[in-house]
Interface confidence: low
């Protein structure tokens, strides 16, 4: 009686179980009563990552340099190419099909987390006692200068964008 289901790594065709092609190979011809499944290796720049009965291998992903992408890991006959973003850029989406420049934190905000190839800069407002006077993708909020430790007094209060201004103490006689 012809089978209705096949074992793992097999497929049912013409009422018989044929072996699937291993990862890295594509199907050329199905098995018959007298012959095994015929498979061929994927050519350069192609891959198949599962046991399969595909007649065509998939093209490796192209990490387009004009989209800010570079190769993180070259593809093999069994794996796709993995792209990442160039320095200063991060992926626009999870699939990383293109890249955008890292966001800078505006004055009054500091970098909470520096961007990576897959995530953007995370900014945070400078809390009281801290400031940032630059637009930067790297700089954290900096603490206000401590006038007292320099034996000076605060002449102008600091803000989230400016440091305090220190000056000499008025020595009244």
């Amino acid at each position: 009686e012809p089978p209705t289901a096949c074992r793992e790594k097999q497929y049912l065709i013409n009422s018989q179980c044929c072996s699937l092609c291993q990862p890295g190979q594509k199907l050329v011809s199905d098995c018959t009563e007298f012959t095994e499944t015929e498979c061929l290796p994927c050519s350069e720049s192609e891959f198949l990552d599962t046991w399969n009965r595909e007649t065509r291998c998939h093209q490796h992903k192209y990490c387009d340099p004009n989209l800010g992408l570079r190769v993180q890991q070259k593809g093999t006959s069994e794996t796709d190419t993995i792209c990442t973003c160039e320095e200063g850029l991060h992926c626009m989406s999870e699939s990383c099909e293109s890249c955008v420049p890292h966001r800078s934190c505006l004055p009054g905000f500091g970098v909470k987390q520096i961007a990576t190839g897959v995530s953007d800069t995370i900014c945070e407002p400078c809390p009281v006692g801290f400031f940032s006077n630059v637009s930067s993708a790297f700089e954290k909020c900096r603490p206000w200068t401590s006038c007292e430790t320099k034996d000076l007094v605060v002449q102008q209060a600091g803000t989230n964008k400016t440091d305090v201004v220190c000056g000499p103490q008025d020595r009244q006689r």
Epitope: S43, E44, S45, Y62, C63, D64, P65, N66, G68, L69, R70, V71, K74, E86, L89
Partner: antibody
């Protein structure tokens, strides 16, 4: 038609200086990294330097580091190679080449006709 | 520093297949490309990213790269393919060229 035309080559004494230029046309110059490659008489290709599309990233061969400077003027569609402290071994045909992309350098897909630099006393 | 090694010369009869190799430590982990240079002319890119062919390059040119060796294959070699061939790869922010291979088409 994509074209690169080098100029500025010539005869110079050892220790002298020279500035090579490469005028680009037929493509968006500011979108591509550019390179200089040289070829000494009867020898193979030798990479000299590469600059990214914005001019912010530069790369040099050890043999020219500290003596040569690559730069570009995207408003003029021109690539430059400033060569100082020239030596006899710098004698070669210098080619300007367009890279395949902005940031990552897969290959040089367009080459100029070359300009000859001769360093001799 | 990284080095790419090519045979100085390769000979082939017209219509036959020519293979030019380029070897370097773990070259298969990098992308290789190939240039053709005829006497008195500028180099021309014939293969990039291991096996991709720029438009205008005949289908008889193909490339592969795995392990420590990249190979340029010219099937059905013609007299016009006689030239110097150079492999190239990027390694640690520097471009490296092979020493070049002179392809001679016999006859």
């Amino acid at each position: 038609e994509v074209q690169l035309v080098e100029s500025g080559g010539g005869l110079v004494q050892p220790g002298g200086s020279l500035r090579l230029s490469c005028a680009a046309s037929g493509f968006t110059f500011s979108s591509y990294a550019m390179s200089w490659v040289r070829q000494a008489p009867g020898r193979g290709l030798e990479w000299v330097s590469t600059i990214n599309n914005s001019g912010g990233g530069t790369y040099y061969a050890d043999s020219v580091k500290g003596r040569f400077t690559i730069s570009r003027d995207n408003s003029k569609n021109t690539l430059y190679l400033h060569m100082n402290s020239l030596r006899a071994e710098d004698t070669a045909v210098y080619y300007c080449a367009k890279e395949g992309g902005k940031y990552y350098y897969y290959a040089m897909d367009v080459w100029g006709q070359g300009t000859t630099v001769t360093v001799s006393s | 520093s990284y080095e790419l090694t090519q045979p100085p010369s390769v000979s082939v009869s017209p219509g036959q297949t020519a293979s030019i190799t380029c070897s370097g430590d773990k070259l298969g982990d990098k992308y290789a490309c190939w240039y053709q240079q005829k006497p008195g002319q500028s180099p021309v890119l014939v293969i990039y990213q291991d096996s991709r062919r720029p438009s205008g390059i005949p289908e008889r040119f193909s490339g592969s790269n795995s392990g420590n060796t990249a190979t340029l294959t010219i099937s059905g070699t013609q007299a016009m393919d006689e030239a110097d061939y150079y492999c190239q790869a990027w390694a640690s922010s520097t471009v490296v060229f092979g020493g070049g291979t002179k392809l001679t088409v016999l006859g």
